[in-house]
């Protein structure tokens, strides 16, 4: 790259600096004699004037000027000459520079080259040598291989021969499996017909044991009847002994009304005479429907028509809308009596409600209620409870007022969860409420802190599942 | 089986705090709400507080209100009860108890006492100088 610079050295004359490439170059070019000092009335920067200049004067500057420009031209002449002569000086000397510096570096490189492959030489003669190493290692390995490989066929032929013994041995033991196949198949096929005859024998006891309930209960039935026949038949005998030994009797014997054969609920059977507590045929009210219904016949005066027992947990309580409806279990044992019937039954009169409880305890308690009734499936069979008294609890465990029974597949509480299925029964259920009689039934000591259980709280709380419960109706004026 | 236990109760002067602690098992703590209750000799049973685990609801008697603290961690299936600026009338006998958390009434936000079927066996807590 080039570059020219002009400045005045510290004695004031004018120097002349040329940059070219790494060299620079400095001129010092001498003085003109002729040039007019700076208090020259006409330097070239002083301010023109008004009056114009003699002629002469002109005339005289200007040749001074010329000789001046030709004195400066004949000194850039030379300039230009020395810088030439130098410059190819330079370029030379450059060149040369560049041509040594070139040979050097080729030398080096040579010389590195070599050493290169020297070492890789030496590299190759230890590779060779790894290579030779590694054929007989090799080579012995084969060796070994070889000798194992003749040992595994030995080994094989023995093998071979260990599994034809065996196939001998498991043709003969398949043979042995197939004689006791035939040999069970008949023994199955025999206890195949044993158990078909003992499940005809099962059904035919069955409708025998069927037969013989219902001749016990008719019997039982026709037991009080007698038992009546003849309590009346005593004092008929008797009344008539006494009208024979009065002196003014009349021969004339009263007329008997006709015996009453059907019975609305269990006070009517009381009534009639027949006091043994038991299962009694009741008649839906205005129908010649009949259901079995458990009477008792002992507590607080007898008369009660039971609706709901629990005792043991036999029976399963978690029903559908139509069991509860119709009813289930045995009114010998766990039973519910069926929702439709005690809707008709306390539709047309007024019936008192007792609740029995049992805990684990052996602890007793009841709740009685002046008036219950159950509203008709139109309404979910709504209870309704008026007038609590009774030692299970001064609050009724029944929300009041009634609430809508629900089950397992028709959920009418007021829960937005489904109580049935989280607490299991059939239940007037709230939300879900203080009670389920008809929750799961738990053995003792297994029956605290239950979510499921059968439940009265305002007598044990909550949580407590109950050894036994009774849920018994009578007419009010019984 | 379901259990809870309670601790942490004790004596404390009024003014002062106590932390009570419910331990459940044999349930998930976020299917059930739990609630602590307290009764006072010669008292009925009343209810405290309440949490929603699912929810992260929380319920406080007005009596209580502002000076007790419900919080669960179902890590540990616990339930604490903080109580702070404690009164001589706080004085009872703490339960904590659990009560399914669907089993509530249409428009209701809470349970009523009996709905709670699984009870701790409690935790005395006197407060007095």
């Known amino acids: 790259y080039s570059n020219f610079r002009k400045s005045v050295d510290s004695t004031g004359r004018r120097q002349y600096q040329v940059q070219n490439g790494p060299c620079s170059y400095t001129f010092l070019l001498p003085e003109t004699d002729s040039c007019r000092s700076s208090s020259s009335p006409y330097m070239s920067n002083a301010v023109q004037r008004d009056a114009p200049l003699d002629y002469d004067d002109s005339v005289q500057r200007l040749q001074v000027l010329e000789n001046i420009l030709e004195n400066n031209t004949q000194w850039l002449m030379k300039l230009e000459n020395y810088i030439q002569d130098n410059m190819k000086k330079e370029m030379v000397e450059i060149q040369q520079n560049v041509v040594q510096n070139q040979t050097a570096v080729m030398i080096e490189i040579g010389t590195s080259l070599l050493n290169q492959t020297a070492a890789q030489t030496r590299k190759l003669t230890d590779v060779e040598a790894q290579v030779l190493n590694q054929t007989t290692r090799l080579e012995l390995q084969l060796l070994q291989h070889s000798i194992s490989t003749n040992k595994l066929e030995k080994q094989i032929l023995d093998q071979t021969s260990e599994i034809n013994k065996l196939q001998n041995k498991n043709s003969f033991l398949e043979q042995k499996v197939l004689d006791m196949e035939g040999k069970h198949s008949e023994q199955l096929q025999s206890m195949k017909e044993q158990k078909d005859e003992l499940q005809v024998l099962v059904s035919k006891q069955s409708s025998v044991i069927d037969e013989l309930e219902k001749k016990l209960v008719t019997a039982t039935v026709n037991n009080s009847l007698l038992q009546k026949q003849q309590h009346d038949l005593m004092e008929t005998v008797n009344s008539l002994l006494t009208m024979m030994s009065s002196p003014n009797s009349k021969s004339s014997v009263a007329i008997r009304k006709e015996e009453q054969t059907t019975f609305r609920d269990c006070a009517e059977i009381f009534k009639s005479g027949l006091t043994t507590s038991g299962i009694y045929t009741l008649t839906f009210p205005n129908s010649t429907e009949e259901i079995k219904a458990y009477c008792d016949m002992d507590v607080g005066g007898g008369g009660w028509t039971v609706i709901q027992h629990r005792e043991d947990g036999s029976v399963d309580f978690q029903r559908t809308w139509k069991e509860y409806k119709e009813g289930f279990g045995s009114p010998l044992g766990e039973y519910w009596l069926g929702n439709e019937f005690v809707s008709q039954l306390t539709g047309q009169h007024r019936y008192v409600l007792k609740i029995q409880l049992k805990d684990w305890e052996g602890n007793e308690a009841h709740s009685l209620y002046d008036h219950f009734y159950l509203a008709g499936e139109e309404s979910n069979y709504r209870i309704h409870l008026t007038g609590l008294t009774g030692t299970a609890g001064k609050i009724s465990s029944i929300s009041q007022p009634g609430s809508d029974f629900s089950t397992k597949d028709s959920d009418n509480d007021k829960c937005i969860c489904k109580c049935s299925q989280m607490l299991s029964g059939g239940w007037w259920f709230d939300a879900c409420g203080p009670s389920n009689l008809n929750g799961q039934y738990y053995p003792q000591k297994q029956n605290t802190n239950k979510f499921n259980g059968i439940k009265w709280y305002y007598w044990k709380g909550s949580g407590y599942s109950l050894k036994a419960t009774t849920m018994m109706i009578r007419p009010a004026d019984f | 089986d379901v259990q809870l236990v309670e601790s942490g109760g004790g004596l404390v002067q009024p003014g002062g705090s106590l932390r009570l602690s419910c331990a459940v098992s044999g349930i998930t703590l976020d299917d059930y709400a739990i609630g602590w209750f307290r009764q006072a000799p010669g008292k009925e049973r009343e209810g405290v507080s309440a949490?929603?685990?699912?929810?992260?609801?929380?319920y406080y008697a007005d009596s209580v209100k502002g000076r007790f603290t419900i919080s669960s961690d179902n890590s540990k299936n616990t339930v604490y009860l903080q109580m702070n600026s404690l009164r001589p009338e706080d004085t009872a006998v703490y339960y904590c108890a659990a009560v399914p958390a669907g089993r509530l009434r249409y428009g209701e936000q809470w349970y009523p006492i009996y709905e709670y079927d699984a009870w701790g066996q409690g935790t005395l807590v006197t407060v007095s100088s």
């Open positions: 949490i929603r685990s699912s929810g992260g609801s929380t």
